[in-house]
């Protein structure tokens, strides 16, 4: 079994390992999230994503988690167990992103653009919150991201 984000295949990443890393810090992260009325990875970001679109979307989302979320949270936390869990997630996200090569062909532009618009909906919601709250919420929503990604884990 492996991830199939449309035409983009990802080998060597097992969802169970991602879930185990997240579950280790889930309660801590979600307890720290004080803004329960808002969601970053809202339904409209992830629903009805076509297979072709999924490669672009997962690429932009995971890159954002790596460059903005994990990177900034790493500088803010000292709890060893939390750091270890997020390092596991980050390393696996790096492995996934490194294997994703979304097509840059012109005929794919409408699919690519739609994925970027979905991503912007997420990023704009993230940027509207203050940094601390946004990071906490994004980390607490890794389960939403993993649940969506798991749909693309196939034989």
């Amino acid at each position: 079994q492996e991830f199939h984000f449309g035409p983009c295949q990802v080998k060597g990443v097992v969802p169970q390992k991602l879930w185990e890393a997240f579950w280790a810090v889930k309660d801590t992260m979600q307890a720290q999230d004080n803004i329960t009325s808002a969601r970053l990875l809202q339904q409209e970001v992830l629903q009805n994503v076509s297979d072709a679109e999924s490669c672009y979307l997962v690429h932009t989302l995971l890159e954002f988690y790596l460059k903005t979320v994990f990177k900034n949270y790493h500088n803010r936390t000292v709890e060893v167990r939390t750091l270890k869990s997020f390092s596991t997630l980050a390393n696996n996200f790096v492995l996934i992103v490194s294997q994703l090569q979304p097509s840059q062909e012109n005929e794919m532009f409408s699919i690519r653009d739609s994925a970027h618009r979905r991503f912007l909906l997420f990023r704009r919601a993230f940027k509207q919150l203050d940094v601390e709250a946004a990071l906490t919420k994004a980390l607490g929503e890794v389960d939403i991201l993993l649940t969506w990604m798991q749909k693309f884990y196939k034989l």
Epitope: H116, L120, L121, R124, Q128
Partner: antibody
Framework: EVQVQESGPGLVKPSQTLSLTCTVS??????????WSWIRQPPGKGLEWMGV???????YYSPSLKSRTSISRDTSKNQFSLQLSSVTPEDTAVYYC??????????WGQGTQVTVSS | QAVVTQEPSLSVSPGGTVTLTCGLS?????????PGWFQQTPGQAPRTLIY???SRHSGVPSRFSGSISGNKAALTITGAQPEDEADYYC?????????FGGGTHLTVL
Amino acid sequence: EVQVQESGPGLVKPSQTLSLTCTVSGGSITTGTYSWSWIRQPPGKGLEWMGVIAYDGSTYYSPSLKSRTSISRDTSKNQFSLQLSSVTPEDTAVYYCARDDVAAPGYWGQGTQVTVSS
Amino acid sequence: QAVVTQEPSLSVSPGGTVTLTCGLSSESVTTSNYPGWFQQTPGQAPRTLIYSTISRHSGVPSRFSGSISGNKAALTITGAQPEDEADYYCALDIGSYTVFGGGTHLTVL
């Protein structure tokens, strides 16, 4: 191809609320992942982004106008609207609505002139 | 609020090549800012040329191209035509909002 058209009063009195509507044809405002923007251009000056309503109905505004701006949509009429409160003569401008490509306007309306004067 | 900078004016000879740039006051411009470029002639509504750094809007001639050059977004016109004389604006996404630059007036002479 999608087309957008602005409408509303051409003259508004100071301290009142400016209300403009953008009517969309050639496609539904709820189809796809598109966002819908308002931009304005004071006479002889550059473009100023005012705000956007995303496909899920969430809204985002320019920090400098946030306290006075509201964007909403009426999906049954395939329209989205701009309200700008407490207007002054500095709000005199051509107001444009647009459908976004990605994070920036793609298809623009012809614009509607709004003058703020008593 | 972020400030987006553009050259106030530039000129190019017909058939020549010109590059317009778009910078951010506080940081480098990257593809994550989704740079867009717009052309406006007097009395007309703006027209979208480029969005998402490099994507040409439908119907835009291939002589217009977008890129990131150094720490700025860039619009290059290769083989400028007399009808390219206009004001050019860039726009950058700054997270939860968008900002336009002050515009560049391009003269073709």
